[in-house]
């Protein structure tokens, strides 16, 4: 990712910029954007970034709001990179089962599972 | 999901079945399955379930190991349902920004971001 700051710092900065520019971003009263109806955000990265694209095209650019969308684009690059790494290594069944166990463990403890 | 037990209970039961059948599942010494090289499991659900399919096709069925793969198939159905809900509702910019802020907050606190 062509960024001088680590992704974790990039996310923090983006959160701050989002708060700063909120008033400007919500100026369009008529715009509607798809919003996921659950809290398992990682499952919805494509839709989130499509929404960001819609918002960017409707927002007057300039100053630090440009920085916000640049950051969001770098975060997208990071996530796309992570997605590429999903099938990168072919490992033994043992390793796959460890990962599957980890995945189900995370589902069990961290996912928001509505009854 | 056509299952009598809630998804959370299904996940717990599947974790237990995975431990029970581990020895049988790892019997194939030569089989290689793609394993993600990071810990952000939700980004890799497609690859994980492709791997489960590969494993199932190589595993002698019968008894409770069948129950394991049935459970995993129900979990996949649940996740596919969640993915469909990613773009289900078109909301105002305000709501989208709330969700985006939440997403970045989760990235900031819960994602495993390697330097």
């Amino acid at each position: 990712i062509p960024t001088e700051i680590p992704t974790s710092a990039l996310v923090k900065e983006t959160l701050a910029l989002l708060s700063t520019h909120r008033t400007l971003l919500i100026a369009n009263e008529t715009l509607r954007i798809p919003v996921p109806v659950h809290k398992n955000h990682q499952l919805c990265t494509e839709e989130i970034f499509q929404g960001i694209g819609t918002l960017e095209s409707q927002t007057v650019q300039g100053g630090t709001v440009e920085r916000l969308f640049k950051n969001l684009s770098l975060i997208k690059k990071y996530i796309d990179g992570q997605k590429k790494k999903c099938g990168e290594e072919r490992r033994r069944v043992n390793q796959f089962l460890d990962y599957l166990q980890e995945f189900l463990g995370v589902m069990n403890t961290e996912w928001i599972i509505e009854s | 999901i056509p299952t009598e037990i809630p998804t959370s209970a299904l996940v717990k039961e599947t974790l237990a079945l995975l431990s029970t059948h581990r020895t049988l599942l790892i019997a194939n010494e030569t089989l290689r399955i793609p394993v993600p090289v990071h810990k952000n499991h939700q980004l890799c659900t497609e690859e994980i379930f492709q791997g489960i399919g590969t494993l199932e096709s190589q595993t002698v069925q019968g008894g409770t190991v069948e129950r394991l793969f049935k459970n995993l198939s129900l979990i996949k159905k649940y996740i596919d349902g969640q993915k469909k809900k990613c773009g289900e509702e078109r909301r105002r910019v305000n709501q989208f920004l709330d969700y985006l802020q939440e997403f970045l907050g989760v990235m900031n606190t819960e994602w495993i971001i390697e330097s």
Partner: antibody, heavy 119, light 107 residues
């Protein structure tokens, strides 16, 4: 910054027991598998044991199987190695190590703790 | 178990020399191989992972190559601070196994 600090080493008689600890900080401990590796004086490195992030999977070298037990307390960010029925050949510096990502285990290493088994 | 045969066991070279260490696995390990540097009295330090990837903040004079069973570790221009023992290690399967080590000295 990732930090791993081993403790619990010392002198013990053959047949005795010892429990090593490794205090971890600077990363999400419960998300990573952890390992123990040892090095006898003047010798090379030997992997001892690994435990997955949740503690659900454990692996051991044949040389320690049935005598050593690896465990972890994710609420305390601490890794353990319970060593029983110790032998002279278990004398070594014991290092704990954090995985880089799935199954690429030995990324960051602690500075090690010396275990001496002698009468 | 997968055996890792590392050679040479020791070598002596001059500052600026190119140094090569080889590691052979007893079976195909794809590219699941790490290289470590260990200085006297210190813990090992990861230099190369997945056979050829340079770990963050490791000088670019270090490199790794190979796949399957044959792997090579290279120091393109030996520096005084590179005096250490170098180990290869496979992580294809348990038990994880190391090469016997190569002690690098300055001539």
């Amino acid at each position: 910054e990732v930090q791993l600090l081993e403790s619990g080493g010392g002198l013990v008689q053959p047949g005795g027991s010892l429990r090593l600890s490794c205090a971890a900080s600077g990363f999400t401990f419960s998300s990573y598998a952890m390992s123990w590796v040892r090095q006898a004086p003047g010798k090379g490195l030997e992997w001892v044991s690994t435990i997955s992030g949740s503690g659900g999977s454990t692996y051991y070298a044949d040389s320690v199987k049935g005598r050593f037990t690896i465990s972890r307390d994710n609420s305390k960010n601490t890794l353990y190695l319970q060593m029983n029925s110790l032998r002279a050949e278990d004398t070594a510096v014991y290092y704990c190590a954090k995985e880089r990502y799935n199954w690429n285990y030995l990324h960051y290493w602690g500075q090690g703790t010396l275990v001496t088994v002698s009468s | 178990d997968i055996q890792m045969t590392q050679s040479p066991s020791s070598l002596s070279a001059s500052v600026g020399d190119r140094v090569t260490i080889t590691c052979q696995a007893s079976q195909d390990i794809i590219n699941y191989l790490n290289w470590y540097q260990q200085k006297p009295g210190k813990a090992p330090k990861l230099l190369i992972y997945s056979a050829s990837n340079l770990e963050t903040r490791v000088p670019s004079r270090f490199s790794g190559s190979g796949s399957g069973t044959d792997f090579t570790f290279t120091i393109s221009s030996l520096q005084p601070e590179d005096i250490a023992t170098y180990y290869c290690q496979q992580y294809d399967n348990h038990p994880l196994t190391f090469g016997g080590g190569t002690k690098v000295e300055i001539r």
